[in-house]
Structures are given as C-alpha cells and as structure tokens.
C-alpha cells in the first residue's frame, strides 16, 4: 500500500530571479483531488491553500506581491489527498535581485573570438561580496559561480560556437540576494583557428561546475513541469 503520494512540481512565475519590490508567483502542481497544499519556506510552514473544488484543480499559486530579501530562500510544497500526504517537492531557490550595486562584466580577449581561443569572463563589484555568478542567457541557461574579493574569473577554456551568446553577471551578497545584473556582453564565436596552436596542454574549465537551469520564460518552457523538475533549479546546491 502506497504510504505517500508522488511529489508535486514547484516553480516560480515569471522567473525564480525576482527584482526587489517586484511580484512573483510560486506555483505548486500536485494531483486532481488534492484538498490541501502547503508551501514551506526554509523548512517552516509558510502558506496553505485549499482548492475548491479539489477534483477540478491540480495546481495552486502562492502570490508574493513585493519581493524582498526576507522572502528570498528555499521553498518547497506538499499536498494532501484525503489523509495521505505527498512527498515534498524539489527545492525552489527564490532569489531577490537588484540589490545595492551593479557589477561590470568583461571578457578577455574580446567579444569576438575564433573557435579554439581561450576566453575568460571577469565579474567585478567593489562592494562587499565574495561570490559572483555568470549567466548565459537562453533557452537552457548556464550559471557558473566564482569567488574573489572584488572580482571573480570565469575561464571558459578554448571555446566553440556553442559558447556563443549573451552573458551577464551578478554579485551575490548571500545565496539568495544578488546584485543588479551587469550590462550584457555578447560573445561571438566564429570559425576555426588556422595555422596556430593555442597551448592545448592548458586545462579547460571543468564541465561539472556548470549547472543547466531554465531562466527564460518566453518559450513557455516553464510550463514543462517534467523538465523543470528534472533541472530542479538547483542553482545553489
């Protein structure tokens, strides 16, 4: 006999990165017939919703009208059908952005490179922060963490055309409070290097430090709950 129901899916609309004082909705999708949904924040009960009629609703929304640093953190949800509770959802990291200052993103050797060149991004912020985040925008966005007193380096290693795209960075004051985003830098990667060697013995940046996260909503991907659950927004873990 089943002791728990399948875990629900949790996601944020329009985005899990929320500018301060802006609104965000945390969505929790369970099963039809669920009589109660609970949203937990940092391990404690935060809000409860009882859908009516439960047999016609399989998703609830918890609205946050005014995002701030106190509301940023890890959320999860559970639901109940009768007396049977579900497994908890994966954790949703809700991040408040546009805090304090704006970093500067720079790229060596430049915004236009040839496939095979070693590219390094630098994120600089003079205020008190030691963690930085580099994001590549797109359908399946990449986030990389770096550390430094006022600046972090993000070596991409020898690049390919797959590295093409628009990059931004943030300074992080804590795991869930980020600065304003930098202005974007668009990296253009063309062709192949001819008749030159680029020190292939140099180590490339280890691939396992990249996470893949869905940071855009234009494509409607955030409705693809299976994909969201797979990526799980495990940005900070």
């Amino acid at each position: 006999q089943q002791q728990t129901l399948p875990k629900p899916f949790i996601w944020a609309e329009p985005h899990f990165m929320v500018p301060k004082e802006k609104q965000v909705t945390i969505c929790c999708q369970g099963n039809y017939g669920a009589v109660e949904y609970q949203l937990h924040f940092e391990g404690s009960l935060f809000a409860v919703d009882r859908p009516k009629p439960p047999e016609r609703i399989n998703k609830v929304q918890f609205y946050i009208p005014d995002m701030n640093s106190r509301m940023a953190g890890q959320y999860s949800c559970i639901y109940r059908v009768g007396e049977l509770w579900s497994e908890p959802s994966n954790l949703l990291d809700l991040v408040v952005t546009e805090m304090y200052d704006t970093p500067t993103l720079s790229v060596h050797p430049g915004p236009e490179v040839i496939s095979g060149e070693k590219v390094t991004f630098y994120c600089r912020l003079d205020t008190a922060t030691s963690m930085f985040l580099l994001l590549k925008e797109g359908r399946s966005s990449h986030v990389q963490r770096g550390y430094g007193k006022v600046q972090a380096e993000f070596p991409l290693g020898p690049v390919t055309t797959a590295h093409r795209g628009t990059y931004r960075c943030f300074g992080s004051y804590n795991n869930h409070a980020w600065s304003f985003p930098s202005e974007p830098v668009k990296l253009l990667v063309t062709g192949d290097i001819e008749n030159t060697s680029l020190a292939p013995e140099d180590p490339t940046f280890p691939a396992d430090t990249w996470g893949t996260y869905l940071l855009t909503t234009e494509t409607g991907l955030q409705k693809d709950h299976a994909l969201w659950d797979h990526t799980a927004q495990n940005l900070l873990r």
Epitope: V107, H108, P109, K118, E183, L198, A199
Partner: nanobody, 121 residues
Framework: QVQLVESGGGMVQAGGSLRLSCAAS??????IHWFRQAPGKEREFVAR????????FYADSVKGRFTISRDNTENLVYLQMNSLKPEDTAVYYC????????????????WGPGTQVTVSS
Amino acid sequence: QVQLVESGGGMVQAGGSLRLSCAASGRTFNTIHWFRQAPGKEREFVARIWWIGGATFYADSVKGRFTISRDNTENLVYLQMNSLKPEDTAVYYCAADARYTSHGYYESDYWGPGTQVTVSS
C-alpha cells in the same frame, strides 16, 4: 615595473606602409592588443595576438591590410600596416591583456603612451 612602449609611427602617403612595434617588459602577458584613436573618435580595436601559440584576430576594417606578429625572444609585437588609407590616421596604442567590458569599451591595466600615424592623400 611593467612597461609598454610603441614606436614606428610617422607620416606616409596613402597606399604606403608602416611597421609599428610594441615593446613589452616587466612581466609576461597572455595577449597584446593594438588599438587606435582618431581625433574626436572613440578608441577602437585593431588587432590582437596571443603570446603563446600566436593566434591572431583583426578588426574588419584592417583585415587583409594589417598583420600582427610577435617576436617572443625580444618581447616585441609588430603591426605591419600596408595599403594605408587616410582613415587609418590615428594614435596607435598597444595594451596587454585588454578586456572588453559590458560598458562597451576595452580596459587594460597596461597601456603604452601611443604612436602617431598620419596618412595623407
């Protein structure tokens, strides 16, 4: 003490050639970039070269006319400029490990003082 010094500038007729040099001393660098700045205009990227490997990259405006090269033993980087045009007139600067910023310009901790190139028609 880190130093970059350009030389080789001068006056030349349109269609002529010049070779600029950039002498780098004080430490090793990954790349040397050449930039130029014409009167009343923004500083613009011209070309770059990696010390190790020698990979090069050029701005479209100079591709096929300018060649950047290096002499590792002498710590020199050259910019060979052929088929010069009046619009190539500018002060030419070399910079070490320059980075393009999200504010739309290049920055570097190490710039040379520049050398003037004037191309007359």
